[in-house]
Interface confidence: low
């Protein structure tokens, strides 16, 4: 089996071979690329914290688990992992923390077994709508992806394109309906202000959805109705003020769901009554005894489960003549 790179395979700083569409493997694809460590027994290649600027062309054909973390890849072009012969067994690809700011259309094409993809901790200013689908067809060939990890991919404010970051990410998730088989989607820590209306309806196979540590204020226009397989929904550390009746009913109707709602600034006024009633009855919310009010001031740190309808009042709306600017 291949062993950690020996001095015989010294790293060349000149650009590795790239064909126009498919990078050709060496005729013997079972070697270990320079600056990587390989275990054929574990079917694993690790090219970690090596400041690689490109994906190695000479990845061994046996690779199932590929770690390309902590590098300086900048751009993933179309066919970045396309090889001859193809990397037919590659199932798990981790590209986290590799300074990617652009992922182009078809970047993950020719990976027929790719089930897990982690792009976390990359400042993705430009994520092509066709990064995961590979083509701009209205219906693409199904992607084999089952897990897509996109935590903390939001770029710094000054590097964002003149468009909605949420919209850019969702466009990539929905293009060509390629991700119909996706079971786990992690979108934590992305400063999301909202979740576009149709996104979840088009990901019907989801089992696990992580939206924690975003800036979601409301789920009013988000429908969970189609997510009949959903097992976990992480909404911790957002800006949620209240969950309304429609959302509560949809969540309650999901047979396997566990919802995580910690550390949201719940507003404990009259609009919270339905949610409090639901919390007292439901078993779907994990750690529901930890949920506390943030507003109004008089209610701060009160436990939601301990509230009753008398506690949840709204200040009367002043008649127009008494309103001040």
């Amino acid at each position: 089996s291949s062993s950690p790179t020996s001095s015989a395979s010294s790293f060349s700083s000149s650009a590795p071979f790239l064909a126009s569409a498919v990078s050709a493997q060496p005729p013997l694809p079972d070697q270990c690329p320079a600056l990587c460590e390989c275990s054929e027994a574990a079917r694993t290649v690790k090219c970690v914290n090596r400041n690689l600027t490109e994906v190695p062309t000479d990845l061994p054909a046996y690779v199932r688990n590929l770690f390309l973390t902590g590098n300086q890849l900048a751009v993933l072009p179309a066919g970045a992992f396309a090889r001859r012969p193809p990397l037919a067994e590659l199932a798990a690809l981790n590209l986290s923390g590799s300074r990617l700011d652009e992922v182009r259309a078809g970047a993950f094409e020719h990976l027929p077994s790719l089930r897990q993809l982690d792009l976390s901790h990359n400042p993705l200013a430009d994520l092509s709508p066709f990064a995961f689908s590979g083509s701009n067809a209205s219906v693409s060939a199904p992607s084999p992806l089952v897990e897509l990890i996109l935590n903390h991919i939001v770029p710094p404010e000054d590097e964002r394109q003149n468009r909605s970051f949420e919209g850019m990410v969702v466009a990539a998730l929905l293009a060509g309906r390629a991700l119909q088989g996706l079971r786990r989607l992690e979108l934590a820590s992305n400063h999301f202000l909202y979740l576009p209306r149709d996104v979840l309806a088009q990901l019907p196979s989801l089992r696990h959805l992580d939206l924690s540590n975003n800036s979601l204020v409301s789920l009013t226009y988000v429908s969970f109705r189609n997510l009949t397989h959903l097992e976990s929904l992480h909404l911790e550390d957002n800006a949620l003020k209240v969950l309304h009746n429609g959302t509560l009913a949809e969540l309650q109707g999901l047979p396997h769901i566990r919802v995580f709602l910690d550390n949201n600034p719940w507003v404990c006024d009259c609009h919270m009554a339905d949610m409090v009633t639901w919390l007292k009855e439901t078993e779907v919310v994990q750690g529901k005894d930890r949920l506390t009010c943030a507003y109004p001031e008089k209610m701060r740190n009160r436990v939601l489960l301990e509230l009753n309808s008398a506690d949840l009042d709204c200040d009367p709306i002043l008649p127009p003549s008494l309103q001040t600017s």
Partner: antibody, heavy 121, light 107 residues
């Protein structure tokens, strides 16, 4: 003793076909890739094609793509090169050689003696 | 395709001479370069693989080295049986390509 023995060469008219065989012995056939390399009279070496140890993947030089087919029968420890639509410029000694898949960039470490293919009318 | 430009195309040397043959790849081929010796009417024989690794059974007077995309085959002290044609070959990317060959003749 490792041996590769080519056979099947001969004189053929332009547009004709030939099938070359490469019989391997003395090593575990399924652990190696097999390449075909040719050498026109008085010229240098030209790579033609290769097949992986499982037989699941093949690759060809542009000059023969669509005309030549490489295959292998692991039960017989034999690789084949089916050559169709032969041209005068295909005239050469054809060698099969093995590539050690367990060594990084190993090179073609054993070669057959070669078989001459002559395409002429 | 990756071109392997080999030089010189021929050279004359005497027994005992130090001989150097070079090959330049048109783009990065990592260390995926091999060197072969071929005598008239015979199949090529592998001398060096992975740019600098001496193949089993090859005399130690043969050596290979790499500097970026430049590869060198050195025969430290030429012997009578070394008069032959030498080829470099890259196996980094398909199509596999060979250098044009260097014929080493007796001076």
């Amino acid at each position: 003793e490792v041996q590769l023995v080519e056979s099947g060469g001969g004189l053929v008219q332009p547009g004709g076909s030939l099938r070359l065989s490469c019989a391997a012995s003395g090593f575990t056939f399924s652990s190696y890739y097999i390449h075909w390399v040719r050498q026109a009279p008085g010229k240098g070496l030209e790579w033609v094609a290769y097949i992986t140890s499982t037989g699941s993947y093949t690759e060809y030089a542009d000059s023969v793509k669509g005309r030549f087919t490489i295959s292998a029968d692991t039960s017989k420890n034999t690789a084949y090169l089916q050559m169709n639509s032969l041209r005068a410029e295909d005239t050469a000694v054809y060698y099969c050689a093995r590539y050690d898949r367990s060594t990084r960039y190993s090179g073609l470490d054993y070669w057959g003696q070669g078989t001459l293919v002559t395409v002429s009318s | 395709d990756i071109q392997m430009t080999q030089s010189p195309s021929s050279l004359s040397a005497s027994v005992g001479d130090r001989v150097t043959i070079t090959c330049r790849a048109s783009q990065s081929v990592s260390s995926a370069v091999a060197w072969y010796q071929q005598k008239p009417g015979k199949a090529p024989k592998l001398l060096i693989y992975s740019a600098s690794s001496l193949y089993s059974g090859v005399p130690s007077r043969f050596s290979g080295s790499r500097s970026g995309t430049d590869f060198t085959l050195t025969i430290s002290s030429l012997q009578p049986e070394d008069f032959a044609t030498y080829y470099c070959q890259q196996a980094y990317a398909t199509p596999v390509t060979f250098g044009q060959g260097t014929k080493v003749e007796i001076k």
